[in-house]
């Protein structure tokens, strides 16, 4: 008898885009409309929830902009939370200080991306220092991952 | 009889580098010499042409520089075009404003990278706002993707 | 008789983090503690040593910061060395000039990431122009790759 057809495993992947009704940290994300992807990973209250242990490439971009530069320090973090551990683990972080000319309209992006060994039930989030300076266009601010 | 040898599928991948004879948008790319990769994907008039539907990680870096900073707004976009759709879709974008000190020699990069579900016949391109401010060194300005 | 169990090949992957006792170029990396990954790739004197020819996604982020901006040109390079070739090959590079306001405390990141065809025995390194301006926090400065 011929072997059973190979079961094509669904690729674990996510690409979430900026959601302008984020009011506090962590950032919240669009998980349904537009160029969004969510397969084999869950989205819950701003976080991507891992359901299979393994190696993942995780990335995020945040687009900061303002009308009148006052050089507030900017930070952009991808961090991990797991009920087994008491503290959040910062996986990747970008910081900016003294990045624009005082009083001028300004714009700048922060990009992060790297490989991590994630465990089932890990929750991944994105945090920024100045929510009011984030622009949430889907092409400009996003958060994603895929299992290697 | 033993089963036929497994057919190792060619990885769909591209890494194209800056081409200084770009005169208009979209940017054109070096697809032959140097650290270039092009396998299972076609290059046509500045665009990467997808020939198999699936999930792809797409990335681009552009290196902007100038001699007497005027702070012209800079933008760097990766966008998609498909004959089925009337309009280009901006997949990823970076913008910079007020990024250098007036009159000074300056240099800055923009990096973009994320996962997308692409369809056979999609054409991917890179656009910049100020072509004259782009430096096309192969290590500095590039455009690539690979199928997950 | 049933076929032998499939041998699950170990994924070739590395994620190394900043090591503050770097004294000269190339940068040295933490390869043991924290959120480090090293599997199927060797680490030797600042370099990742490839032991299987193939396609790899290679990335690095460097976090530069200073107490009093004097706009020293910053560069961040990922380069490759192989005993067969006389010269280092710069794979990816980021440069920054005129990026902060003179005299101010400042901070800025450079991110690089792309796909390359690497050969067994290739050594990959990271170089920066101003070692004293690099901050080596594990979440901020890192170097990694994975085989596609």
């Amino acid at each position: 008898p011929s072997p059973p057809p190979e079961k094509k495993e669904l690729r674990k992947v996510a690409h979430l885009t900026g959601k302008s009704n984020s009011r506090s940290m962590p950032l919240e994300w669009e998980d349904t409309y537009g160029i969004v992807l969510l397969s084999g990973v869950k989205y819950k209250k701003g976080g991507l929830v891992i359901n299979e242990t393994g190696l993942y490439f995780v990335y995020s971009k945040v687009y900061f902009r303002g009308q009148s530069c006052n050089n507030l320090p900017l930070s952009h973090k991808v961090y991990m939370r797991n009920s087994k551990y008491p503290q959040d683990l910062v996986m990747m972080e970008g910081k900016m200080m003294s990045y624009c000319t005082t009083g001028q309209m300004w714009a700048r992006s922060s990009y992060l991306g790297a490989v991590f060994n994630l465990t089932s039930a890990d929750h991944l989030y994105v945090n920024v220092s100045e929510l009011s300076l984030v622009n949430f266009e889907e092409s400009q601010t996003f958060f994603g991952l895929y299992k290697l | 009889p033993s089963p036929p040898p497994e057919k190792k599928e060619l990885r769909k991948v591209a890494h194209l580098t800056g081409k200084s004879n770009s005169r208009s948008m979209p940017l054109e790319w070096e697809d032959t010499y140097g650290i270039v990769l092009l396998s299972g994907v076609k290059y046509k008039k500045g665009g990467l042409v997808i020939n198999e539907t699936g999930l792809y990680f797409v990335y681009s870096k552009v290196y902007f520089r100038g001699q007497s900073c005027n702070n012209l707004p800079l933008s760097h976009k990766v966008y998609m075009r498909n004959s089925k759709y009337p309009q280009d879709l901006v997949m990823m974008e970076g913008k910079m404003m007020s990024y250098c000190t007036t009159g000074q020699m300056w240099a800055r990069s923009s990096y973009l990278g994320a996962v997308f579900n692409l369809t056979s016949a999609d054409h991917l391109y890179v656009n910049v706002s100020e072509l004259s401010l782009v430096n096309f060194e192969e290590s500095q300005t590039f455009f690539g993707l690979y199928k997950l | 008789p049933s076929p032998p169990p499939e041998k699950k090949e170990l994924r070739k992957v590395a994620h190394l983090t900043g090591k503050s006792n770097s004294r000269s170029m190339p940068l040295e990396w933490e390869d043991t503690y924290g959120i480090v990954l090293l599997s199927g790739v060797k680490y030797k004197k600042g370099g990742l040593v490839i032991n299987e020819t193939g396609l790899y996604f290679v990335y690095s982020k460097v976090y530069f910061r200073g107490q009093s901006c004097n706009n020293l040109p910053l560069s961040h390079k990922v380069y490759m060395r192989n005993s067969k070739y006389p010269q280092d090959l710069v794979m990816m590079e980021g440069k920054m000039m005129s990026y902060c306001t003179t005299g101010q405390m400042w901070a800025r990141s450079s991110y690089l990431g792309a796909v390359f065809n690497l050969t067994s025995a290739d050594h990959l390194y990271v170089n920066v122009s101003e070692l004293s301006l690099v901050n080596f926090e594990e979440s901020q400065t890192f170097f990694g790759l994975y085989k596609l």
């Epitope: 001028q104 | 001699q67 005027n70 | -």
Partner: antibody
Framework: QVQLVQSGAEVKKPGASVKVSCKGS????????IHWVRQAPGQGLEWMGV????????SYNQKFKGRVTMTVDKSTSTVYMELSSLRSEDTAVYYC????????????WGQGTLVTVSS | EIVMTQSPATLSVSPGERATLSCKAS??????????MNWYQQKPGQPPRLLIY???NLESGIPARFSGSGSGTEFTLTISSLQSEDFAVYYC?????????FGQGTKLEIK
């Protein structure tokens, strides 16, 4: 064709201020910074500062800091250079010149404005 | 600031002959493979005119008898065969960093 046209000659008393204009035409005005260079009679060239025609902010030679102000009026494609607390050694021809950000040098210059400071 | 020193202050050459003008910078004006050194010509009552940019590149519309060379701190402007219209003052200028600085000029006069 590209032109930078400067305002006419001025005679000023010591302690006064002078405002010289430079109007660009024949090119996209906001794509180029404008630099100011002066030349005292029989002397060499001295760089005074530069203004971003797009953003409107300026960088000045420390030697003139506090005395020079450069401004831009995008609506008329005109840049202004004001020098205050004039002294006799400020007597010079003042030039504006445009600088393409993507290039290496000041490629077009105004015709110059003679400012004479005399009591 | 970078100090530019030109020599000689005055150069007397006959028409048709070759003229070599020198410019030294107090520190290197090179960066990333380029030399940020420019040469200008100025005639009485006129603004300076760009001749050579980035040490050795001829500005469009400038005759090929003008050439520039050098890197780091030492640069040369050469006029291969002097024409009557070439007698003027020549300035070198660095655009490596602000404040931009000029040499004091070399006056090229008819011998």
């Amino acid at each position: 064709q590209v032109q930078l046209v400067q305002s006419g000659a001025e005679v000023k008393k010591p302690g006064a201020s002078v405002k010289v204009s430079c109007k660009g035409s024949g090119y996209t005005f906001t794509d180029y910074t404008i630099h100011w260079v002066r030349q005292a009679p029989g002397q060499g060239l001295e760089w005074m500062g530069v203004i971003s025609t797009y953003q409107g902010d300026a960088s000045y030679n420390q030697k003139f800091k506090g005395r020079v102000t450069m401004t831009v009026d995008k609506s008329t494609s005109t840049v202004y250079m004001e020098l205050s607390s004039l002294r006799s050694e400020d007597t010079a021809v003042y030039y504006c010149a445009r600088f393409p950000d993507w290039d290496y040098a000041m490629d077009y210059w105004g015709q110059g404005t003679l400012v004479t400071v005399s009591s | 600031e970078i100090v530019m020193t030109q020599s000689p202050a005055t150069l007397s050459v006959s028409p048709g002959e070759r003229a070599t003008l020198s410019c030294k910078a107090s520190q290197s004006v090179d960066y990333d493979g380029d030399s940020y050194m420019n040469w200008y010509q100025q005639k009485p009552g006129q603004p300076p005119r760009l001749l050579i940019y980035a040490a050795s590149n001829l500005e469009s519309g400038i005759p090929a008898r003008f050439s520039g060379s050098g890197s780091g701190t030492e640069f040369t402007l050469t006029i291969s065969s002097l024409q009557s219209e070439d007698f003027a003052v020549y300035y070198c200028q660095q655009s490596r960093e602000l404040p931009y600085t000029f040499g004091q000029g070399t006056k090229l006069e008819i011998k």
